[in-house]
Interface confidence: medium
């Protein structure tokens, strides 16, 4: 095209341009070092530092890390960017209570309204289920028949955590940071009996006081609401439920509005020194030789040539059925399978021990 | 498996130049950085800086800048640093690393180094 | 650049005793810290990644905690083989910066 030929001598001779002749276009030369954010820059603002995957460019120009939304309680919202982190928010049916900067630091499930109460607003990522009376007749805001159920006689009506399907939890949402515990626990969470009474499960119709039973106007039956992970104690003050976030424990019972969270050591460990609703100490039972971990094979265009999956140490065994291949009825809790992308595997805590299944994916290995 | 092999030990005098390589084998070159850092004795660990073999793209620390240049051969996978104008404060052992390809982020902590090349600088 | 600090610089240990290397970044880095152990003459392996993740084949009397500033590699029931000198590492923000190392001595 001779049409393009004076465009393209414009460029010849200026060294901080080239011809692109895709674009049929004079293009700025990024200099060394800098990237090109667009096909054919066009002066230097269109050149920029190139960051490492995972890593993002700062408003300070420093490559810094993107957030990761590895626990099993987050999905990610918006991916890693050059200019922009990811951005993690709790997964469907759970809300933020903590947040932290482009993530969450503590996610809850959405409450259920209870019996006399209908939503009002349904719950988001970022805020509880708002509830509010049920006018009388059956109500238009009912979202669903269990959110309009009035209760069997002799029941007391409580706020119960909304059930999610573990399903829902995908392989690139499965715990990492949290490993274990975070498995445990979102398994206690999910086969959780409904109506048992949980401290991710409240109303929010007031946000300071929480019915025992729905609140007649001008009653004084309501009790005073503590925050998440704290509870009623015996005083009246909210108290903080003990954590089972310790690798060697599990939690027993959850944290409910009137009592604390309960711990104990988990499976293949016993308790040395107990404490208050926890165990101070777990040891582990006697142990035997562990059985050799098999390298697992290359599986896609990434290589996959280490030595062994990112999982900890192959952990002495100890002679119980929770060792190695789970029966076919082990709960959530002694064993999770890792369904992961073939070159990439999911790290597990440094005392979270692990075994191969015979696919060479990863096992969480209670024992 | 991965291994990073670098080159022999280099023995320069002031104001010269040196060019030390590292040869990748066991994956595929083009996926990963690779990365250099410097280890002085009695000094903390150095990060370089890294190059990118698949665009030729490097990065370096800003104390490094103008004293390295990080290039890489995709037909020999071996990627090459040059240190410039050295003076005495360059003597160290220098290490080419990779990162792991670990869990479902790429963050940058080292799995895979060379075994080192020890460059002395002496009139 | 964020400075890594580390200590004690030298520890003096004997076989079975547990010791305690600690790091402290100077802005918050989260949880991305590695540790390093380098044996004489050796590069550095890698044992904790994510601050608080054993890479595999590590043994597990090596573990790592820490968020935020403050991180800790704890060698539990030492051995001879484990003289080497420990560096933690932030991967958080390029440059990516070291510890100034650990020197164990058994």
């Known amino acids: 095209f001779p049409q393009d030929r004076p465009f393209e001598d414009t460029c010849h001779g200026n060294p901080s341009h080239y011809y692109d002749k895709a674009v049929r276009r004079c293009c700025y030369r990024c200099p060394m070092g800098l990237f090109p954010t667009q096909q054919c820059p066009q002066r230097p603002t269109d050149c920029r530092k190139q960051c490492e995957p995972d890593y993002y460019l700062d408003e300070a120009d420093r490559c810094t890390a993107c957030v990761t939304c590895s626990r099993d309680d987050l999905v990610e919202k918006t991916p890693c960017a050059w200019n922009s982190s990811r951005v993690c928010e709790c997964r469907p049916g759970m809300f933020c209570s903590t947040s932290a900067v482009n993530s969450c630091a503590r996610c809850f499930f959405h409450s259920v309204c209870p019996a006399g109460m209908i939503v009002k607003f349904p719950g988001t990522a970022q805020k509880n289920t708002v509830c509010e009376p049920a006018s009388p007749g059956v109500s238009p805001a009912c979202a669903s028949p269990e959110n309009c159920k009035e209760p069997s006689s002799g029941t007391i009506p409580q706020a119960k955590p909304t059930p999610v399907s573990p399903a829902t939890s995908s392989a690139s949402t499965m715990p990492v940071r949290g490993g274990t515990r975070l498995a445990q626990e979102a398994a206690s969470k999910l086969t959780r009996a409904p109506d048992s009474p949980s401290s991710v499960g409240r109303p929010s119709s007031d946000p300071g006081l929480s019915p025992t039973q729905p609140c007649p106007e001008g009653s004084g039956d309501c009790r005073k609401q503590c925050e998440p992970d704290y509870y009623l104690d015996e005083a009246g003050r909210c108290t903080a439920c003990v954590s089972c976030s310790r690798d060697d424990l599990v939690e027993k019972t959850p944290c409910a509005w009137n009592s604390s969270r309960t711990c104990e050591c988990r499976p293949g460990m016993i308790c040395a020194t107990s404490a208050t609703n926890s165990c101070a100490r777990c040891v582990p039972y006697p142990i035997c030789a562990a059985e050799t971990v098999t390298k697992p094979q290359d599986m896609a265009e990434k290589d996959t040539t280490f030595e062994a999956p990112p999982l900890g140490t192959q952990p002495d065994c100890n002679p119980t059925p929770e060792n190695g291949e789970a029966p076919a009825s082990t709960s959530p809790t002694q064993s999770l399978l890792v369904d992961s992308q073939a070159s990439k595997t999911l790290p597990i805590p440094t005392s979270a021990p692990v075994a191969l299944s015979s696919t060479g994916k990863p096992v969480l290995d209670a024992g | 498996q991965v291994q990073l092999q670098q080159s022999g030990a280099e023995l320069a005098r002031p104001g010269a130049s040196v060019k030390m390589s590292c040869k990748a084998s066991?994956?595929?070159?083009?996926?990963?950085?690779i990365h250099w850092v410097r280890q002085r004795p009695g000094h903390d660990l150095e990060w370089i800086g890294y190059i990118n073999p698949s665009s030729g793209y490097s990065d370096y620390n800003q104390n490094f800048k103008g004293k390295t240049t990080l290039t890489a051969d995709k037909s020999s996978n071996t990627a090459y640093m040059q240190l410039n104008s050295l003076t005495s404060e360059d003597s160290a052992v220098y290490y080419c690393?990779?990162?792991?390809?670990?869990?479902?982020?790429?963050?940058?902590?080292?799995?895979?180094w060379g075994q080192g090349t020890t460059v002395t600088v002496s009139s | 650049d964020i400075v890594m600090t580390q200590s004690p610089k030298f520890m003096s240990t004997s076989v079975g005793d547990r010791v305690t290397v600690t790091c402290k970044a100077s802005q918050n880095v989260g949880t991305n810290v590695a540790w390093f152990q380098q044996k004489p003459g050796q590069s550095p392996k890698v044992l904790i990644y994510?601050?608080?993740y054993r890479y595999s084949g590590v043994p597990d009397r090596f573990t790592g905690s820490g968020s935020g500033t403050d991180f800790t590699l704890t060698i539990s029931n030492v051995q001879s083989e484990d003289l080497a000198e420990y560096f933690c590492q932030q991967y958080h923000t390029y440059p990516l910066t070291f510890g100034g190392g650990t020197k164990l001595e058994i």
């Open positions: 066991g994956y595929t070159f083009t996926t990963y950085t």
């Open positions: 994510s601050a608080s």
């Open positions: 690393a990779r990162r792991a390809d670990y869990g479902n982020y790429e963050y940058t902590w080292f799995a895979y």
